[in-house]
Amino acid sequence: AYRPSETLCGGELVDTLQFVCGDRGFYFSRPASRVSRRSRGIVEECCFRSCDLALLETYCATPAKSE
């Protein structure tokens, strides 16, 4: 389990996104929703404060399909 009391920055954040997202790949920011004009990026959410697995997974890209 990810230790939620700690923050993830730089290489630690990239490592964890790569491992968790795997073949999906990942984004550093999500597209802004209709509700919010500005979407927080993962650095703001996981480096400046702690984040959990569920939040990390929201930055995984939409699964690609095999050719």
Partner: antibody, heavy 118, light 106 residues
């Protein structure tokens, strides 16, 4: 050439502890996240634990959470797996592994056998 | 967790004949990855990204499939191909492997 060499396996009684080590060479260890994968006798492969390159992020499979701790010493190019409260179902060959993006679990050690038996 | 189910559990094929191994995921995945494990050795990456051969892998090995159904094919079985083959999904956390398929010579 990537080389991973595990050690520390052996026979242990249920409820006891064991610490596995994995000595890495042939690559810049501190730049790579690492994982442990295990293989029970005559069974398949099971991812066990993950640690980021600097050690700040760890993940575990549900069945070992709270009992196993993955850690690393980048100054010694060594990965560890501390296994506490061992159970018979933890009996397996434990492999130290790492990967490049897309080349998942591309590099493996030879494994170390852990037998939990009374 | 995504459950990976391989079929058959084992198969015996004559030298020079085709061997086909299937892997089904309980949910759709982006790609499938395949590993070969010979007795007394660690697994070795064989095919990544569904159909790409890892370095040094002979072209008699091929992979295909999409969604939930994937296939590993050995077009002309050689003696050195005797091994257990595993599929892996990395599209969903946690990573999960198939139970393995043992390939023997008939």
């Amino acid at each position: 050439e990537v080389q991973l060499v595990e050690s520390g396996g052996g026979v242990v009684q249920p409820g006891r502890s064991l610490r596995l080590s994995c000595a890495a060479s042939g690559f810049t260890f501190s730049n790579y996240y690492m994982t442990w994968v295990r293989q029970a006798p005559t069974k398949g492969l099971e991812w066990v634990a993950y640690i980021s390159s600097g050690g700040g992020s760890t993940y575990y499979r549900d069945s070992v959470k709270g009992r196993f701790t993955i850690s690393r010493d980048n100054s010694k190019n060594t990965l560890y797996l501390q296994m506490n409260s061992l159970r018979a179902e933890d009996t397996a060959v434990y492999y130290c592994t790492t990967e490049d993006y897309g080349y998942w679990f591309a590099y493996w050690g030879q494994g170390t056998l852990v037998t939990v038996s009374s | 967790d995504i459950v990976m189910t391989q079929s058959p559990d084992s198969l015996a094929v004559s030298l020079g004949e085709r061997a086909t191994i299937n892997c089904r995921a309980s949910s759709s995945v982006s790609y499938m990855h395949w590993y070969q494990q010979k007795p007394g050795q660690p697994p070795k990456l064989l095919i990544y990204g569904t159909s790409k051969l890892a370095s040094g892998v002979p072209d008699r090995f091929s992979g295909s499939g999409s969604g939930t159904d994937f296939t590993l094919t050995i077009s002309s079985l050689q003696a050195e191909d005797v091994a257990v083959y595993y599929c892996l999904q990395r599209s969903s956390y946690p990573p999960t492997f198939g139970q393995g398929t043992k390939v023997e010579i008939k």
